[in-house]
């Protein structure tokens, strides 16, 4: 922390301007009034403060607003946002998308994923739900940021908004997030025709249950291997060789390369070797011919 000193009369600050770049840290601490700083935050980003000087300005704001900054200050943080921790951001209440845009622009090119994720979370909380305007802002200014939201926050996305989500926005989504988004996407695209539906639903399929994957296998979709590899293991394991063949179409030839990777490896272990051989790829590891498969889990459930 900066030690307290009194401000020399000639250094007294009446407005935030470029002259402050010549102030030492302790002079800034002593001479800049926090309320003045907050009122003139819109000027701060235009002044080439050092990171050390920004630390002092942040300290001033923290003292003035121990419960979290008001949005009027947050909107104009500019490069001061780079000094914020997720803990600082958690105290904020942000509702304006202009504020979100401004801070997303500042964070670009900096390692701030935790801060950005917290900021987006605060925006969703502040606005009450993840509405279309928020999704549009995220996809435009922060591709991939949608996946930084928790499954709980994503559950506030209305299905009508799903159409605004692009495939690349889902690249970093984990299984739990796709579990939340998939049923919404299914609902949003339910009135589309087969091929159009598949194109739209494809990025969300990492959250699809077995029944839906089986249904797709009956629709001549020719699922590409990258999409197949992103399906839930639990959704893939119950599929038969014939269903996988129909689901992938010509893409089934790519299974050979993925033979050792999940979910293909786990799926192979559950198939009869005879059936795997029909794929013509030399896939190995299936259940040998003549072996009887006992599903003990069924017996346990009955007893």
């Amino acid at each position: 922390d900066v030690e307290r000193t009194t401000c020399p009369p000639e250094k007294e600050v009446h407005e935030i301007d470029e002259s402050l770049i010549f102030y030492k840290k302790r002079e800034l601490e002593a001479c800049v009034d926090a309320a003045l700083l907050a009122a003139q935050m819109d000027r701060v980003d235009a002044i080439p403060f050092t990171y050390e000087q920004l630390d002092v300005l942040k300290h001033k704001l923290d003292e003035l607003y121990p419960q979290g900054y008001p949005e009027s200050v947050i909107r104009h943080l500019g490069h001061l946002f780079l000094k914020m921790s997720p803990e600082d951001i958690r105290k904020w209440n942000v509702t304006s998308l202009e504020t979100l845009k401004a801070l997303l622009k500042v964070s670009k090119g900096h390692e701030m994923s935790a801060q950005v994720a917290t900021l987006i979370d605060r925006v969703v909380v502040g606005r009450g739900q993840l509405d279309k305007d928020t999704v549009d802002t995220l996809t435009a200014f922060c591709p991939g940021c949608l996946c930084s939201l928790s499954p709980e926050r994503l559950s506030s996305v209305p299905p009508s908004v799903i159409g605004a989500v692009r495939p690349q926005d889902l690249d970093t989504c984990g299984p739990r997030q796709l579990d939340v988004l998939y049923p919404k996407a299914r609902l949003a695209f339910q009135n589309m025709s087969g091929s159009e539906y598949f194109v739209k639903i494809r990025p969300f399929l990492g959250g699809a249950p077995t029944e839906d994957v089986k249904a797709l296998s009956q629709q001549n979709v020719s699922m590409d291997l990258a999409t197949f590899m992103k399906l839930r293991r639990e959704a893939v394991l119950p599929l038969t060789v014939a269903e996988v063949q129909k689901l992938l179409g010509p893409h089934v030839e790519g299974l050979k390369v993925e033979e050792q990777h999940s979910p293909v490896r786990d799926w192979i272990l559950k198939q009869r070797q005879d059936d795997l051989d029909t794929l013509g790829l030399g896939l190995q590891g299936g259940i040998p011919n003549g072996y009887l498969i006992l599903d003990l889990s069924v017996r346990e459930a009955l007893s």
Epitope: P250, E253, G254, V257, D277, G280, L281, G282
Partner: antibody, heavy 121, light 107 residues
Framework: QVQLQQPGTELVKPGASVKLSCKAS????????MHWVKQRPGQGLEWIGN????????YYNERFRSKATLTVDKSSSTAYMQLSSLTSEDSAVYYC??????????????WGQGTTLTVSS | DIQMTQSPSSLSASLGGKVTITCKAS??????IAWYQHKPGKGPRLLIH???ELQPGIPSRFSGNGSGRDYSFSISNLEPEDIATYYC?????????FGGGTKLEIK
């Protein structure tokens, strides 16, 4: 070693059909799909389609769907391509090729010598 | 389908020199490109796969590079036996596609 043997030439009349063969040896025939490629005189290579030799399931380049029919005979480790309603446009060298599944969908590491098909009356 | 645009369609170079051929894919092919040498009366010969991986037995005069949609193939220290037509092949999609070919001649 791996070999794909194709007859050198075929001469057929317009409107007729022809069945080109590709006999594989040196590897397990049913472990690799067989692909067919066309090259017209003075032109580039064009992928026609492929076939799963284990279940006989073919996939075609849309341009050749009504022209080519791919089949296999597992007992003789031979792949066939029948070309129907032949015209001068079908005069070309036809290659069979075997993929190596090293990455993605596999690149072709073994090729036949090609069969030169001439369609002429 | 993925289109592969290969250029130039023909080129002439001196013995000992270097030539470069390019292939542009109509979409990202994730480095899944192979390069072939083709001489009359023979099947194409695989030189390079996965953008830059040299096949066993292929001299290091042959090299490949690229990512995304743009790829290149080079031959340095040109030798008389390099006279051939060269093709790129994308195998990022099961429906494979070739470039139009580049005919290499020696000056």
């Amino acid at each position: 070693q791996v070999q794909l043997q194709q007859p050198g030439t075929e001469l057929v009349k317009p409107g007729a059909s022809v069945k080109l063969s590709c006999k594989a040896s040196g590897y397990t025939f049913t472990n690799y799909w067989m692909h067919w490629v066309k090259q017209r005189p003075g032109q580039g290579l064009e992928w026609i389609g492929n076939i799963n030799p284990s279940n006989g399931g073919p996939y075609y380049n849309e341009r050749f769907r009504s022209k080519a029919t791919l089949t296999v005979d597992k007992s003789s480790s031979t792949a066939y391509m029948q070309l129907s309603s032949l015209t001068s446009e079908d005069s070309a060298v036809y290659y069979c090729a075997r993929p190596y599944y090293g990455s993605s969908y596999g690149y072709f590491d073994y090729w036949g010598q090609g069969t030169t098909l001439t369609v002429s009356s | 389908d993925i289109q592969m645009t290969q250029s130039p369609s023909s080129l002439s170079a001196s013995l000992g020199g270097k030539v470069t051929i390019t292939c542009k894919a109509s979409q990202d092919i994730n480095k899944y490109i192979a390069w072939y040498q083709h001489k009359p009366g023979k099947g194409p010969r695989l030189l390079i796969h996965y953008t830059s991986e040299l096949q066993p037995g292929i001299p290091s005069r042959f090299s490949g590079n690229g990512s995304g949609r743009d790829y290149s193939f080079s031959i340095s220290n040109l030798e008389p036996e390099d006279i051939a037509t060269y093709y790129c092949l994308q195998y990022a999609n099961p429906l494979r596609t070739f470039g139009g070919g580049t005919k290499l001649e020696i000056k």
